[in-house]
Each structure stands twice: as structure tokens, then as C-alpha cells.
Amino acid sequence: SAPFSFLSNVKYNFMRIIKYEFILNDALNQSIIRANDQYLTAAALHNLDEAVKFDMGAYKSSKDDAKITVILRISKTQLYVTAQDEDQPVLLKEMPEIPKTITGSETNLLFFWETHGTKNYFTSVAHPNLFIATKQDYWVCLAGGPPSITDFQILENQA
């Protein structure tokens, strides 16, 4: 991953929420659900309405990066997806409001969002070689690739 000192120089400014109340499904069509207060996991659901709904906020980089940088919040909450280290679960961090500016160690709240057809990838800004991923019998975590699943489908709210 990129050196921390390099990342800490970049400032990210909040622009706007670009998606509301969407579901993330992995390549096995398992949906992301709440495992507990702190962690997420993936499971096959008999009703997709039971999946976690996310909002996505866009940030602009002071580096004028071409990548789309986003924050992921659980809809109707103040809980934000936060990266830890490789193979560690992502955490749900409570914050009173969406951060207006993010820099330094707080970049663990941010992800580069890439799309390839219907596949969506979320790379950690703090760990640019690691993706949000699902893993069998484990929490949603950060991983570099297989056997973890790193590509997701976004299911939009039709309401």
C-alpha cells in the first residue's frame, strides 16, 4: 500500500450524497447485513429488504485525482464504514455528521469507487491495494483479492 506520509498530504472535501438507500450484493449474490453493532457480514436473504441500505457521499481530492472518492454510510444512521488493515473487518464508526474535510489517518473512512460493467469495487484510500470484500464465514473486511470476494452489485432503491 502507499506510504502513509504520502496519503496524509492529500485533503478530501465533501461534495454531496450521490446515492441513497442502495444494497450491496457480492458476486455470490449474498447481501451485506449487520452482524452486530460494529461489524457487517454477507448472507443469502429470502427478502432483500432485510439487507443493509447504504448512502454514498462523494469527495473531491486536493490532488485532483481522476478516481471517484466516496464515503459509505448506513442509511438513516450516523454509522460510517471504516477500513482497518488487511483481513481485518471493516468497522462501523459513529460520527455526529458527515465529515466536511478528510485528511491523514481519517482517510480510512474513504474508498475509491470503480465500476466495470455491473461490477463495483471499493478500494481503501488508506490502503490502495485493498478492497472492501466478503469472505465465507467472516465479516466484511479488507482484502487484496481471492478467496475473498471484492466485486459487488449495487441494487438501487426503486421507491
Epitope: I23, N25, L28, N29, Q30, S31, A44, L45, H46, N47, L48, D49, A51, L155, E156, N157, Q158, A159
Partner: nanobody, 120 residues
Framework: EVQLLESGGGLVQPGGSLRLSCAAS????????MFWVRQAPGKGLEWVSV????????YYADSVKGRFTISRDNSKNTLYLQMNSLRAEDTAVYYC?????????????WGQGTLVTVSS
Amino acid sequence: EVQLLESGGGLVQPGGSLRLSCAASGFTFNQYNMFWVRQAPGKGLEWVSVISGSGRFTYYADSVKGRFTISRDNSKNTLYLQMNSLRAEDTAVYYCAKGWWRRDPPFDYWGQGTLVTVSS
């Protein structure tokens, strides 16, 4: 007893439209994903679309995206599939199914099917 009864199939010309219906009974309809799947002559089952219990979330196979629309009326316990811009390759028996979003097998119940033939 769970029952799923499809209707609305028939012969239609390429570019035409059809609306399939599926009447459901025997379970709490609004608490389950519902699916449309199809089986073309001599082929295996192909998943077409899914809709969540409330109808708020839908997803489509790439082969039908932009042409087909899944919907449901929970007050009538009925699932629908609006099929537009039909092509010869859409010819199949269409089944509605109840079940998990992805399991092996993914569906715990499905109907007897309705035949859609797209031909000039």
C-alpha cells in the same frame, strides 16, 4: 400450501410486448423475494429478475435489462413481468418462483410456467 400460478404467455411478434402475471397464495407474500426464471427449448433454467418483498429493490439479468420490468402488487399477492422489445431468443417457458436471492438450488417453490413464443 404454497401455490404460484403464472398467466399471460402467448405468441408475439419480434419487437412486441407481453405482460406476465403470477398469482401467489399460501405464504406471506410481502415478506419474500420473488423471481422470474425461464427455460428456453433444450436449455437450462435462466434467472431473469428478482424483486424484494416490498418491491423497493429489483435486479435483472443482463440479457433483459432495459426491456423487462418486474413489479408486484402486495395487496393482490401478484407478481408481474412486463416484457417489451421481445426477441426470438426470449422464447421460453417463464416461471415465477419464491426463494433466496442465491442459494443452490435458489428457489424453494415455483409455478407450472407460462409459454412465451416470439416469432414472426
